[in-house]
């Protein structure tokens, strides 16, 4: 059997007066009862109607009734002021049944042919209601064959009576410190058969205050207290209400942090309801008094639970809790009316005693020992041997608590050793090897560690030397015994330094020529600069103008002398620079391989020989006087030469330092 709705059997048919279409007889009475299925009604209309006309249809008539109600009493052919004929009218039963009664009296003045009518059952549209009648459904009405059903808007649920829409108005929780709540649909009429529960739930310590606003209209009764619809307010302390009628209830100060509002409505009435504006209060905290040199924000008339304030200090003052600094301070009012943190102080910023400046000193300008905001100090370097690097040495205690230079630097100035100072003011004539006097070559460094070599002090913690002189110690820097500040090689009176790291030029290949024969030694501590220990200067860009062919440089060291022994006393020799092509040619012939002299080398010495550096001098500096700055600078590093030092026609070969300035600067800045 097919599934689906079971349709009722069709109900339709024809009715006619007895004898139709002939004339009807006198004294006739005929009754028809028509019944349609539930949810249906009967429709009836006449295709023919011809009955005797009488006042109020007293004689002959057709009467239509549905239940106890007479729908129409019909006679005649056409309607008059007091009688009705059906004409083209259609008649509908009020329910599912229709009674039709035909009657004729004892006489007719002329023959009448009676009536013919047709009927059929049709669906009742229960959703259509006559004006002034109550609607079938509260919200939405849906008609269907044989019946109807109701549905509700969102936020409502259909009551068990299947017609009323009850509001879904329970379980709302308000947690803000203030807000508004109202009856459903306010200010339109509230729904029927509803039970609404609203909760205000604030943090412990708050007290809810309720104010009824705008209008109040809840169904009431003249004698009984709120029997129909009512509003009740419940706290953990007491119950308020019930409320109904048209008078706004007074303010309710609940003295509670939780409030339950209940609103119940019945099935009748048309009232606009209520609106509540709620606020809250709490025990106020003591008014915060700003500390000296500080201010409170925000400024409020009073501060209650959860309210907060922050303290901001004036420029030059800082938040302190005792000795401990704070970046920010915010206090929160607690439920017991106390602040959760004590008030800090706004203390004048104190930059503290300035750090000691290595090789320098500091002077208090503002006043002895004054280190607070805007105080001024002056750093200076030890005269003669140190100079301050790009800094005027003036520092101010700024609001951030740091001593800050005029350029905004927070780091200490740097006292750089003055380089290139020597007791010798000029390069003399070309002599044989001479004994150095104190202060002549204060950059001279003696390097012991397997062999004797030399180097030159750069700044106060670097030594420039030849790569071949320290190659064996490149992985064991601590094995290098570095001495300075002495003239005598074997003297016990010297300044000891130790190596932290050895940096050999990456282009140097040991036992394969002397190209890139340059190395740097980083000392593990800075040395103190004085007249006997002073760094050599690195060449300026313009230095080549003091290193042309025949310009005189000075080499110094404890290397082999003409007698074939290491010198006991520091020796030096003034020698001229040799034309590069001439030097290259001198080392083209055997036993020297071609290309021994590269562009990274310079040569110095006499064609006649006799004046040269020798083994043991390796790594030492070939220095020149910069006549513009009157400072000595390193132009070459003792690297290699002929088998026999000072040989005629051969020259000493030196690493050309000016080619390595970027390499030196990179190593020193990186390490």
């Amino acid at each position: 059997t097919p599934l689906g709705p079971k349709w009722p059997e069709p109900v339709f048919g024809r009715l006619a007066s007895p004898g139709f279409p002939g004339e009807y007889a006198n004294d006739q009475e005929r009754r028809w009862t028509l019944t349609a299925p539930p949810g249906y009604r009967l429709r009836l209309y006449f295709t023919h109607f011809d009955l005797e006309l009488s006042h109020l249809c007293e004689y002959d008539f057709v009467k239509l009734s549905s239940g106890a109600k007479v729908l129409a009493t019909l006679c005649g052919q056409e309607s008059t002021d007091t009688e009705r004929a059906p004409g083209k009218d259609t008649f509908y039963s009020l329910g599912s049944s229709l009674d039709i009664t035909f009657r004729s009296d004892y006489s007719n003045e002329k023959p009448f042919t009676g009536f013919e009518a047709f009927y059929a059952a049709e669906d009742i549209d229960e959703c259509q209601v006559a004006p002034g009648e109550a609607p079938t459904c509260d919200h939405h009405c849906h008609n269907h064959l044989g019946g109807f059903y109701c549905s509700c808007r969102a936020g409502y649920v259909l009551h068990r009576n299947k017609r009323t829409c009850s509001a879904l108005c329970s379980g709302q929780v308000f947690t803000q410190r203030s807000g508004e709540l109202s009856s459903p649909e306010y200010p339109r009429p509230y729904p029927k058969l509803s039970s609404c529960t609203y909760s205000i739930s604030l943090e412990e310590g708050f007290s809810v205050i309720l104010d009824f606003v705008e209008s109040f209209d809840v169904e009431t009764h003249p004698e009984t207290l709120c029997p129909y619809d009512f509003l009740k307010i419940q706290t953990d302390r007491e119950e308020h209400g019930p409320f109904c009628g048209k008078t706004l209830p007074h303010r309710i100060e609940t003295k509670s942090n939780t409030v339950t509002i209940t609103f119940v409505t019945d099935e009748s009435g048309d009232h606009t309801g209520w609106k509540i504006h709620y606020t809250s209060t709490a025990q106020p905290c003591p008014y915060p008094m700003a500390p000296p040199n500080g201010h409170v924000s925000p400024v409020q008339a009073k501060y209650i639970l959860k309210d907060s304030f922050s303290i901001f200090c004036e420029t030059g003052y800082e938040l302190l809790q005792g000795h401990l600094p704070l970046k920010s301070f915010t206090a929160v009012c607690q439920k017991d009316g106390s602040w959760d943190r004590p008030m800090p102080a706004c203390s004048i910023v104190d930059c503290g005693p300035p750090d000691d400046l290595p090789s320098g000193r500091v002077e208090y300008i503002t006043g002895p020992g004054v280190t607070t905001y805007k105080a001024v100090i002056q750093y200076s370097c030890e005269e003669t041997f140190y100079t301050m690097k790009v800094n005027d040495g003036k520092y101010v205690c700024e609001a951030d608590g740091f001593w800050t230079s005029s350029k905004g630097e927070k780091s200490l100035p740097v006292c750089e050793p003055v380089c290139g100072l020597s007791a010798r003011t000029t390069g003399g004539q070309i002599y044989g090897g001479q004994k150095a006097k104190p202060g002549d070559f204060p950059w001279q460094v003696l390097i012991l560690g397997g062999t004797t070599a030399a180097g030159a002090l750069l700044y106060d913690n670097w030594v420039l030397t030849a790569a071949h002189a320290v190659y064996e110690q490149k992985h064991d820097a601590s094995a290098l015994d570095i001495r300075m500040g002495t003239l005598k090689r074997l003297s016990p009176h010297y300044t000891q330094a130790w190596s932290e790291a050895v940096f050999i030029h990456e282009g140097y290949t040991h036992d394969a020529g002397f190209d890139n024969d340059i190395a740097l030694i980083k000392l593990n501590n800075k040395v103190v600069i004085n007249s006997n220990i002073t760094p050599i200067c690195l060449p300026r860009k313009e230095a080549e103008s003091f290193m042309r062919t025949d310009d005189i440089g000075t080499a110094s060291g404890w290397g082999l002398t003409q007698r074939g022994f290491l010198a006991r006393n520091l020796m030096y020799v003034d020698i001229p620079i040799v034309d590069h092509q001439k030097c290259t040619a001198a080392y083209e012939k055997p036993p020297y391989p071609r290309g021994s002299v590269t562009a990274n080398m310079l040569c110095a010495g006499l064609e006649s020989g006799g004046k040269d550096s020798c083994r043991g001098d390796s790594g030492g500096a070939l220095v020149f006087l910069d006549s513009e700055t009157e400072r000595w600078f390193v132009g070459g590093i003792v690297s290699w030469g002929s088998m026999n030092c000072g040989e005629a026609g051969q020259y000493g070969v030196y690493t050309k330092v000016i080619n390595y300035i970027p390499w030196i600067e990179n190593i020193i800045s990186d390490f």
Epitope: Q321, G322, P325, L326, K327, P342, G352
Partner: antibody
């Protein structure tokens, strides 16, 4: 949740430098507060060594000023302690803490011995 | 430096009883005093700051009072987990200093 964790060698030779690091999680050391180093020699009371503040300023116990350095690495949210020229008297449990002690590390024992 | 002197050095109390610990500062430290609890092998645990402010999570039985030079930590009803060493700490001025501690033991 704020957590502090000390790390570093548990044994240091006399005259060498003691180095410890405190790694902070759950709070940025530049956001606020002072970040302390505190130590407790065996059976003795706590001794505050110094702090580095949110801004990088330092404050040291005058009794240690010539030997102590506190620094920080903001990229790693760490602050460090260096104590030079140590002796047996520097043997202690070393703690890092925040401000007036609302959070502490679990402590690390450093023994100074040859 | 400011010396913080705690008394007594040892306090013997029965569980449920009240314990009152004293701390005296050699100079005025305002209310810049904190109290800590330390158990063997553990780092200190902060209880009170600014003399009387209890840290969140610290039971209400712990309370602090005092200002200037005299400070008190009170444990209203000792629980078994409260037996430990208690330190006071001033952070008013450099150097920050700690008291020698009071050991609270079971009577």
């Amino acid at each position: 949740q704020v957590q502090l964790q000390e790390s570093g060698p548990g044994l240091v030779k006399p005259s060498e430098t003691l180095s410890l690091t405190c790694t902070v999680s759950g709070y940025s050391i530049t956001s606020d507060y002072a970040w302390n180093w505190i130590r407790q020699p065996p059976g003795k009371k706590l001794e505050w060594m110094g702090y580095i503040s949110y801004s990088g300023r330092t404050s040291y116990n005058p009794s240690l000023k010539s030997r102590i350095t506190i620094s920080r690495d903001t990229s790693k949210n760490q602050f460090s302690l260096k104590l030079s020229s140590v002796t047996a008297a520097d043997t202690a449990v070393y703690y890092c803490s925040r401000h007036y002690g609302d959070y502490w590390g679990q402590g690390t024992l450093v023994t100074v011995s040859s | 430096e400011i010396v913080m002197t705690q008394s007594p050095a040892t306090l013997s109390v029965s569980p449920g009883e009240r314990a009152t610990l004293s701390c005296k500062a050699s100079q005025n430290v305002g209310t810049n005093v904190a109290w800590y609890q330390q158990k063997p092998g553990q780092s200190p645990r902060a209880l009170i700051y600014s003399a009387s402010y209890r840290y969140s999570g610290i039971p209400a039985r712990f309370s602090g009072s005092g200002s200037g030079t005299e400070f008190t930590l009170t444990i209203s009803s000792l629980q078994s987990e409260d037996f430990a060493v208690y330190f006071c700490h001033q952070y008013n001025s450099n150097p920050l200093t700690f008291g020698g501690g009071t050991k609270v033991e079971i009577k």
